[in-house]
């Protein structure tokens, strides 16, 4: 089957999510874990990561077409410590499958505001830290 | 169980300098920004200086700026500040903390390590 | 910067009385976080953003507040609670700021 991973992002008042997104078959969740990083080009691994997801297969699901499991990292006020270079992956305990998203950065503006960049499903992202808006 | 061990206070004159070291364990020092807060004598709490994760950045309060240095070791889990030009108002405790990543909250403290400056 | 002032500075309280710290901003902010701190020991983080109690704090502590008014309200004080408690924010470009703190002791 095919299995990808997609790097979002959305913002709800000062708050911003970092989405990790893994499409898989029902039947390939079971030891597959999601994981988060920041800053890490070569390492990037559930124990480097800033947080990490299991992924249980459920019992409740029916068919076997794909899936999405979502991992969600909020951050409830972007500061300047948070510019870097972040990166979504999974691998697989059963399979050894290993995926690794595409780079993204956040970058925090002298203005106090901060832009998300590289992401691929909305390649910029701007935002504005005071009023909270996407623009 | 996260430990932050502050080192390298000491009683010292003004215009003088000082390094303390904040030795930490029991997590991923290399994900987290780290912070340098003191407190006074009898007084309250002042942010002094952040870096972050990697060490790229870092930030001080207005009254340390030019003075103050920040700096972390990733391979060694320590985080240090340079004091410089040392002055009477900087006496105070130096506590080595975490910043929580996901809020704007410091998670973790050491005890602290005491930076008495006079002459 | 934004400044923030805490009120009362210094209070005295019977145990099983309801316990109200207030922490004013020169200017609104998004969350507030509480710190307790104990004589001769380091603050521990007690509420963070605004209401959420940190982990192994008794729930008898609660938090409130928006904009530019934030209070940390103890429900049935007890003599464990006695220490000074300090409120702290996050705001750009002055970064960290804490209040003066308020000290409470029991009667």
């Known amino acids: 089957g095919c299995i990808n991973i997609t790097s979002s992002a959305s913002q709800e008042g000062t708050r911003l999510n970092l989405i990790c997104t893994v499409w898989h078959k029902k039947e390939e969740a079971e030891g597959f874990v999601v994981f988060l990083c920041k800053d890490r080009s070569g390492d990037c691994s559930p124990e480097t990561s800033l947080k990490q997801l299991r992924l249980k297969r459920d019992p409740g699901i029916d068919g076997v077409g794909e899936i999405s499991s979502q991992l969600m990292f909020t951050i409830s006020q972007v500061t300047p410590l948070h510019s870097g270079t972040y990166q979504c992956c999974a691998r697989s305990q059963k399979s050894g499958i290993r995926l690794q998203g595409h780079f993204f950065s956040i970058l925090f503006t002298e203005t106090g505001n901060y832009t998300v960049t590289g992401l691929k499903q909305r390649q910029h992202l701007e935002f504005s830290h005071n009023e909270g808006t996407l623009s | 169980e996260v430990q932050l061990v502050e080192s390298g206070g000491d009683l010292v004159q003004p215009g003088r300098s000082l390094k303390l070291s904040c030795a930490a364990s029991?997590?991923?020092?290399?994900?987290?920004?780290m912070a340098w807060v003191r407190q006074a004598p009898t007084k309250g709490l002042e942010w002094v200086a952040s870096i972050s994760n990697g060490g790229g950045n870092s930030f001080y309060r207005d009254s340390v700026k030019g003075r103050f240095t920040i700096s972390r070791d990733n391979a060694k889990n320590t985080q240090y500040l340079q004091m410089d030009s040392l002055r009477s108002e900087d006496t105070a405790t130096y506590y080595c903390?975490?910043?929580?990543?996901?809020?704007?909250?410091?998670?973790?403290w050491g005890r602290g390590v005491m930076v008495t400056v006079s002459s | 910067e934004i400044v923030l002032t805490q009120s009362p500075t210094t209070m005295t309280a019977s145990p099983g009385e309801k316990v109200t710290i207030t922490c004013r901003a020169s200017s609104s902010v998004s969350y507030m976080h509480w710190y307790q701190q104990k004589p001769g020991a380091s603050p521990k983080p007690w509420i963070y953003e605004t209401s959420k109690l940190a982990s192994g704090v008794p729930d008898r502590f609660s938090g409130s507040g928006s904009g530019t008014s934030y209070s940390l309200t103890i429900n049935n004080m007890e003599a464990e609670d006695a220490a000074t408690y300090y409120c702290q924010q996050w705001n750009y470009p002055s970064m960290y700021t804490f209040g003066p703190g308020t000290k409470l002791e029991i009667k």
């Open positions: 029991g997590f991923t020092f290399s994900n987290y920004a």
């Open positions: 903390a975490t910043h929580n990543y996901e809020s704007t909250v410091f998670d973790y």
